[in-house]
């Protein structure tokens, strides 16, 4: 669809005469009828295919054509057509003069034709005009012509349909050939669909509008790039959505159970040495000088009884001085002026000679010790309790008093409170500092499994497309993790892909 | 050939919500070269287009409706359906689901056989 | 919001031609489509992008769009022919139906 443009520029007719070569009374009133048809190598009369157009009384004898669009587009003449332009065309320009105010063909005499011009060739679609200038022995006729394509037809020959349009049926504005051209922002076949945001994640992001970028489910951050980690995940990360790998040192389901206690919180003082013994349990190996659990008690070099025979410690600030009884002397009083005529040998010790008599040996009973039997054995000074158990001496023996959660003869033993399987249906146990957690399977809650609630959520194979279906735990629902090329909460969607 | 058939009650009481289903068979609804779309027309009145969905799941609804139109799609049974919220007697009407193409600027050119649902209590 | 005009009717002689046209503000700018409905009948898609025939549909039916007014021309009309019909066309994201001329052919 387009239109054939004729513009006509002057006419010179200086005698004023017709075709004939009789004069025009008074003077030549100048019509013009054209005719656009299809190329002829010889111009003939006939039908007028591509369409004909008349204009007014454009002047007497000889005159120049003003431009005018505007009165019912006169000058130029428009000659719409409803085909496919063809690139050839055969023009016929007659003027002719008009005695009355009748211009049909059939009331004009038929020797009121002025002149006839015929002309052909090619034309290609453009926005040039071609400028001519057809001579006759009276007459002159200058003019120019052009064909372009008509609102919304686009290429070489107007042939193209396109109209810009900016909805969900297409955004774009049509080019020269009459091809799309995608607004900003918009790609595919008819520019429907949008360019997402710069560096979202091709199979785990999506969009609906230019620039944006939504993540599939599973998935979250600008570029959707980052996995959602397991509901209630505490310490631990994911590499695909719904994981919960556990950082060092922490373990369990939801990564929440310490297993670095010694690490996270530091609890040995004094630059002891801290070692893991288990959940949320440790052991302080203590510098000398120092005691306690977490070896958070300084010694006294006195605690350690340096001084043999019943002699006495007094604290020093470099050390420690060891006050000595009557027949003893020495740094620890471990050298005697006795014999056993003195009877040295305290608590039922029995005396021995030695060195011809320049020295004794006591042997001392059960319970006491010393070189004089002096001391009442303490069996707890190698600290043999384990896991902060408390030694107390009984007599010949001795016994360690546990800390909660420990047991055995050293406290060496982590009481299991899981041991006497408490979780029903099948719940799994987790020991805890001061109890214990199941963790129930689908179907069932409470402290202990105990009570049945609903079924398996992934049972009923909510998700499609070979998506992989995950139970959260904590709300008995389901989440589905799609394969690449698909989305929604059941991975029903398959995505356009450009 | 494709095909699309509408379904669901033909009787819906005032104020509750109208639900209805369209399968499509004999192609994919999950092509990229179509929107599937909902048309109503009221006995002995014209057609009034009520809203379309793509496979990805963008919507797009008349104006007039927009307050009380659900469409969305189910790729994986190759279905789409309408929900209409707190309907009235002006509702009555013969519901189509249709297929509008890309190619041919948003046109229907498949058409399901329509179903009448009557809102009366 | 978007207005599309049809006449009610239009009343055309078997093998003469019947035009019916579709009024609405810069329709030109738009594609306008044109549906054929027999009584009891789904709509059936008889132009799309002003002027195109879909396969299956007779050539005498044609369109043309310009200016604010499409039309839907149907050269040699036939009693088949009689049904209503329908002008439609995109106003940003919505659908616009006309409200539908009833042709009969005498």
């Known amino acids: 669809s387009g239109v054939f443009q004729l513009q006509l520029q002057e006419f010179i007719n200086e005698r004023g005469v017709l075709a004939s070569g009789r004069p025009c009374e008074p003077g030549c009133r100048t019509f013009f009828r054209v005719c656009l048809k299809h190329f002829q190598a010889v111009v003939s009369p006939g039908p007028c295919t591509f369409g004909t157009v008349s204009t007014p009384v454009l002047g007497t004898n000889s005159f120049a054509v003003r431009d005018d669009s505007s009165g019912g587009g006169r000058n130029p003449l428009q000659l719409p057509f409803n085909f496919t332009w063809p690139g050839t065309f055969s023009l016929i320009i007659e003027a002719w003069h008009a005695p009355g105010d009748d211009l049909r063909p059939e009331a004009l005499p038929p020797d009121a034709l002025i002149s006839k011009i015929a002309i052909q060739g090619s034309l290609a679609v453009g926005q040039n005009w071609l400028l001519d200038e057809q001579t006759s022995t009276l007459t002159r006729l200058r003019y120019s012509y052009r064909v372009i394509c008509s609102d919304n037809y686009y290429g070489d020959n107007c042939s193209r349909l396109c109209k810009k349009r900016n909805d969900h049926f297409g955004h774009y504005v049509c080019q020269p050939d009459g091809n799309l051209s995608c607004l900003p922002g918009w790609t595919g076949e008819y520019c429907q669909q949008p360019i997402c945001l710069s560096g979202c994640h091709e199979q785990n992001g999506y969009c609906s509008k230019p620039a944006e970028c939504l993540c599939r489910p599973g998935w979250q951050g600008r570029l959707c790039n980052e996995c959602i980690p397991h509901n209630g995940c505490r310490h631990g990360t994911c590499s695909t959505p719904w994981q919960c790998t556990c950082d060092e040192g922490w373990g369990g389901l939801f990564c929440d159970q310490d297993l670095n206690y010694c690490t996270h919180h530091s609890p040995c003082k004094n630059g002891a040495t801290c070692s893991n013994s288990g959940q949320r349990s440790y052991t302080c190996t203590c510098r000398p000088g120092y005691t306690g659990v977490d070896c958070e008690l300084e010694l006294s070099e006195c605690d350690s009884n340096p001084c043999r025979n019943g002699g006495s410690c007094k604290d020093q600030e470099d050390g420690y001085h060891c006050l000595c009884p009557p027949g003893y002397y020495g740094l620890h009083c471990e050298h005697s002026t006795l014999s056993c005529a003195d009877s040295p040998c305290f608590n039922g010790g029995s005396c021995r000679e030695r060195n011809q008599g320049a020295n004794y040996a006591c042997e001392c009973p059960p319970n006491f010790t010393g070189s004089n039997c002096e001391k009442k054995v303490d069996r707890c000074t190698s600290n043999p309790c384990a896991n902060g158990g408390q030694c107390l001496n009984r007599g010949p023996s001795r016994m360690c008093r546990c800390r909660p959660g420990f047991t055995g003869t050293y406290c060496e033993l982590h009481v299991s409170d899981c041991a006497r399987n408490p979780c029903a249906h099948g719940g799994t146990c987790h020991d805890l500092e001061n109890g214990l957690m199941c963790t129930c399977p689908a179907g069932f809650s409470g402290r202990r499994c105990e009570v049945r609630t609903s079924i398996d959520a992934c049972a009923s194979s909510p998700c499609f497309n070979r998506a992989t279906c995950y139970t959260d735990l904590s709300t008995d629902t389901f989440v589905c993790n799609c394969p690449y090329g698909f989305v929604g909460s059941r991975c029903e969607f398959p995505v356009g892909l450009p | 050939e494709v095909q699309l058939q509408e379904s669901g009650p033909g009787l819906v009481k005032p104020s509750e919500t109208l639900s209805l289903t369209c399968t499509v068979s004999g192609g994919s609804i999950s092509s990229s070269s179509y929107y599937w779309g909902w048309i109503r027309q009221p006995p002995g009145k014209g057609l009034e287009w009520i809203g379309d969905i793509y496979y990805t799941g963008s919507t797009y609804y008349n104006p007039s409706l927009k307050s009380r139109v659900t469409i969305s799609v189910d790729t994986s049974k190759n279905q789409f359906s309408l929900k209409l919220s707190s309907v009235t007697a002006a509702d009555t009407a013969v519901y189509y689901c249709a297929r509008q193409a890309l190619a041919m600027g948003g046109g229907s050119d498949k058409w399901g056989q329509g179903t009448l649902v009557t809102v009366s209590s | 919001s978007y207005e599309l005009t049809q006449p009610p009717s239009v009343s055309v002689s078997p093998g003469q031609t019947a035009s019916i046209t579709c009024s609405g503000q810069r329709l030109g700018d738009k594609y306008a489509s044109w549906y054929q409905q027999k009584p009891g009948q789904s709509p059936v898609l008889v132009i799309y992008e002003d002027s195109k025939r879909p396969s299956g549909i007779p050539e005498r039916f044609s369109g043309s769009n310009s200016g604010d007014t499409a039309t839907l021309t149907i050269s040699g009309t036939q009693p088949m022919d009689e049904a209503d019909y329908y002008c439609?066309?995109?106003?940003?994201?919505?659908?616009?139906f006309g409200y539908g001329t009833k042709v009969t052919v005498l």
């Open positions: 439609q066309a995109w106003d940003r994201d919505t659908g616009v």
